[in-house]
């Protein structure tokens, strides 16, 4: 009876999300394997988040709006492990917008989700950021490693969206 009611709840939750995400990929987790964590298909998952790589070339503001429509934000990178996971799926000759900007050009970098910007957990390429006119951040492959660079916000780039996993 308990299992039945849990299944019914799960199905109704799935139906609720179906209007936003036509398809979800779920895995069982938790100590009793009773919880399901889901990401929209074909997003990838890492820890408690889902990631989507957009190959559409758009300005930073448009890229953020595009993520927002999907219930996400441009990616906020919190750890080296998270960055290493993300970069596995990136093309080395491309650049991708991050959810990091400095709209006033005062070198006050801010994450789109208001996560505090911690200088100790940043992965700027050597010599970056280097221009107060370049107010948006990308991740790209340079000098044999992935790192961040400041670029003009209006110049179209690919982008990475991130959202919290859906738990059902």
């Amino acid at each position: 009876n308990f299992m039945y009611s849990k299944t019914v709840k799960r199905l109704s939750k799935l139906q609720e999300y179906q209007q936003y995400y036509p398809s979800l990929t779920c895995v069982m987790e938790g100590k009793d394997m009773e919880d399901w964590s889901c990401c929209p298909t074909p997003w990838t998952s890492f820890q408690s988040s889902c990631y989507f790589i957009s190959t559409v070339m758009q300005s930073w503001t448009k890229s953020q709006n595009n993520c927002s429509v999907m219930g996400a934000d441009l990616v906020v990178i919190n750890t080296k492990e998270e960055q290493d996971f993300i970069t596995q799926n990136l093309k080395i000759n491309s650049a991708y917008f991050l959810g990091l900007s400095d709209p006033k050009g005062w070198r006050h970098w801010q994450w789109v989700d208001q996560t505090p910007y911690n200088k100790n957990v940043t992965f700027w390429h050597s010599g970056e950021p280097n221009s107060p006119d370049e107010r948006c951040a990308i991740i790209n492959f340079r000098s044999e490693e992935w790192g961040w660079n400041d670029v003009h916000c209006h110049v179209p780039q690919k982008s990475i969206c991130k959202m919290k996993k859906i738990y059902i």
Epitope: Q58, S59, W60, T61, K62, Q64, N65, S101, P103, K104, G105, N130, S131, P132, D133, E134, R135, C136, V151, H152, C153, H154, V155, P156
Partner: antibody, heavy 121, light 111 residues
Framework: EVQMVESGGDLVKPGDSLKLSCAAS????????MSWVRQTPDKRLEWVAT????????YYPDSVKGRFTISRDNAKNTLYLQMSSLKSEDTALYYC??????????????WGQGTTLTVSS | DIVLTQSPASLAVSLGQRATISCRAS??????????MHWYQQKPGQPPKLLIY???NLESGVPARFSGSGSETDFTLNIHPVEEEDAAAYFC?????????FGGGTKLEIK
Amino acid sequence: EVQMVESGGDLVKPGDSLKLSCAASGFTFRSYGMSWVRQTPDKRLEWVATISSGDSYTYYPDSVKGRFTISRDNAKNTLYLQMSSLKSEDTALYYCARQIYYDYAYYFDFWGQGTTLTVSS
Amino acid sequence: DIVLTQSPASLAVSLGQRATISCRASESVSFRTSHLMHWYQQKPGQPPKLLIYGASNLESGVPARFSGSGSETDFTLNIHPVEEEDAAAYFCQQSIEDPPTFGGGTKLEIK
């Protein structure tokens, strides 16, 4: 006083090449992104090319991509526009303009007086 | 590309009255509190001159009778009271994404 003086405009034939120059003074030229903007005979303003302050980025609309090249010489405080395979629709008054970044975008705070290009057979 | 449509194409306003020029963008040129529309004035035989940046910020040296407002896709330039020297063409411009684009212009005549 900020000044920008364009030169090099001429009457040319379709298919010809031409180089425009813009001599800047009264500001630290190397610190600013610069653009060329043209005004067509019907008075419409049309962006033609942009170059970033550090010379690292250049951008063009599809209408001139592959035919026009923007460049700068920071030592000479001069902006250039090399134009080739010119068409009659390139006929316009060409302005150089200084860019000021504002939040996620930019505007043009100073414009030169312009130089006229006429493409006609 | 973002298309900017200005209206009216021309208008005649009596001295001391209000002139209102509209600029509509084909998609939003705002992001959160940033409204990325700019306005220029062009007198015959002269280059465009910046009046307003960021929808409502008056450029240094521009008289306070000029004001701008708007967000997302709809922006307005107001001139009040209109003076003789305001006879000119007015253009809106966006650069939230490449390519930067301009409106078709509005010609203001003083009656």
